[in-house]
């Protein structure tokens, strides 16, 4: 059986939309599937790599690599999107390409970044971990770390940094899929909202779905002990 909830929820474009949340009900009137997984049920994607989920994550990453920061022209906010999802008339799509990106580093002026920009994250304004020396962030936003400390400055002059961020990574469903969404939408969908991250590639949704002890390598499920827990 399915339980359907409909509600008006604030979405990425800053408008409220009617959203449906479909929950697979437990036939035996008990915990939901997500709760059962958290409690240690035999759920194979938590025990070993699942090809379907792996392909989903790779597809999400490929899309994210090509994303940019969509900044609303009315200063109402910004969100990481694909170019096609950013209004050409009501917003500005900040995406580095060709020669428009910043240099990889102050020591390497010739090589320009082509991957980015990312809403609220920039190698030039992140103090920790700083992009410098032997630790220059790669020209692939899906390999960027989470910035734990921003440079102390009210404004940077960068469109993608001085905007009010409207969406962050949200882990939705038992498949461990990730979407950049508003907090409201994420909570309504019973997802896990990552306040600390800017990109889906920075979070490991399956690790969150599985719960219990974190994977030794966040990319590789290793909870073999589930075979004995349940």
């Amino acid at each position: 059986a399915q339980h359907v909830t409909t509600q008006l929820v604030l979405r990425n474009k800053g408008v409220y939309e009617s959203v449906k949340y479909i929950q697979q009900e437990n036939f035996w009137i008990g915990p939901s599937s997500i709760d059962l997984i958290h409690l240690g049920a035999k759920f194979s994607p938590c025990i070993r790599k699942d090809q379907q989920i792996e392909q989903l994550v790779l597809r999400e990453r490929d899309l994210e690599r090509d994303s940019g920061c969509c900044v609303q022209n009315d200063h109402s906010g910004c969100i990481q999107t694909q170019r096609k999802d950013c209004s050409e008339t009501l917003a500005t799509f900040v995406k580095w390409q060709d020669d428009t990106g910043p240099p990889m580093d102050k020591s390497d002026l010739g090589q320009k970044r082509t991957s980015g920009a990312v809403c609220h994250q920039d190698p030039r304004t992140c103090e920790e971990p700083a992009s410098s020396g032997a630790h220059i962030w790669p020209d692939d936003i899906t390999k960027w770390p989470i910035c734990t400390e921003q440079a102390k400055s009210n404004r940077t002059g960068f469109l993608h940094m001085d905007c009010q961020i409207k969406g962050r990574p949200c882990c939705i469903s038992t498949k461990g899929s990730c979407e950049i969404t508003t907090r409201e939408y994420c909570e309504f969908m019973h997802g896990y909202f990552h306040e600390e991250a800017t990109l889906c590639s920075q979070v490991h949704c399956l690790d969150k779905v599985c719960g219990l002890l974190p994977f030794l390598n966040p990319e590789v499920p290793d909870q073999f002990y589930r075979l004995w827990l349940s």
Epitope: D99, T100, K106, G110, R124, A130, R155
Partner: antibody, heavy 123, light 106 residues
């Protein structure tokens, strides 16, 4: 208010070492992303970049003069120094220090300049 | 080494006139920076990233260009614009400036 003030010997003789000091106020060179550069200008001529130093102590020099230049900083005193060894009359110029900024820029630029200090090399 | 060549070396204009000065680079660069130096004063930044006006710079100033060819335009010259204008590149080390364009008033 951000200001930079250069100071130097005024006059020195060929083969001596020129020592310049840039005193910063209104900002700190220990702040992430900050940099300070030295630029000189012979009287009636154009600008020539000499060197710059960043908050993380990375230093960059004009290769044409690199063997003679040394840039350094004292974060506690909020000062930047430039030494030019073995000067000669061609080093006679006004020496400016300038703050490096990247506000809104994909690169960097010299956004605040000092008033400059005049140095004459003469025997 | 990227050499920047400014032209003309000297130009004169009447108040209210539109003037354009150019800066050519020996190699392709991504962005150009422009500085103004009034007689007896230190330089100040006018334009960064080719076309962005620095803080406090009047809107009569504008910059454009790409590749190896860049220009600075003053839409209506005023007496206070009498100065030498320098272009500068930050595309590769060493950082280089153009020799300058001196703007005089007729």
């Amino acid at each position: 208010q951000v200001t930079l003030k250069e100071s130097g010997p005024g006059i020195l003789q060929p083969s001596q070492t020129l020592s310049l000091t840039c005193s910063l106020s209104g900002f700190s060179l220990s702040t992430f992303g900050r940099g300070v550069g030295w630029i000189r200008q012979p009287s009636g001529k154009g600008l020539e970049w000499l060197a710059h130093i960043w908050w993380d102590d990375e230093k960059y020099y004009n290769p044409a003069l690199k063997s003679r230049l040394t840039i350094s900083k004292d974060t506690s005193k909020n000062q930047v120094f430039l030494r030019i060894a073995n000067v000669d009359t061609a080093d006679t110029a006004t020496y400016y220090c300038a703050r490096i900024q990247n506000y809104g820029s994909n690169y960097w630029y010299f956004d605040v300049w000092g008033t400059g200090t005049t140095v004459t090399v003469s025997s | 080494l990227i050499v920047l060549t400014q032209s003309p070396a000297i130009m004169s204009a009447s108040p209210g006139e539109k003037v354009t000065m150019t800066c050519g680079a020996t190699s392709r660069i991504s962005y150009m920076f422009w500085y103004q130096q009034k007689p007896g004063s230190s330089p100040r930044v006018l334009i960064y990233d080719t076309s962005n006006l620095a803080s406090g710079v009047p809107v009569r100033f504008s910059g454009s260009g790409s590749g190896t060819s860049y220009s600075l335009t003053i839409s209506r010259v005023e007496a206070e614009d009498v100065a030498t204008y320098y272009c500068q590149q930050w595309n590769s080390y060493p950082l280089t400036f153009g020799a300058g364009t001196k703007l005089e008033l007729k």
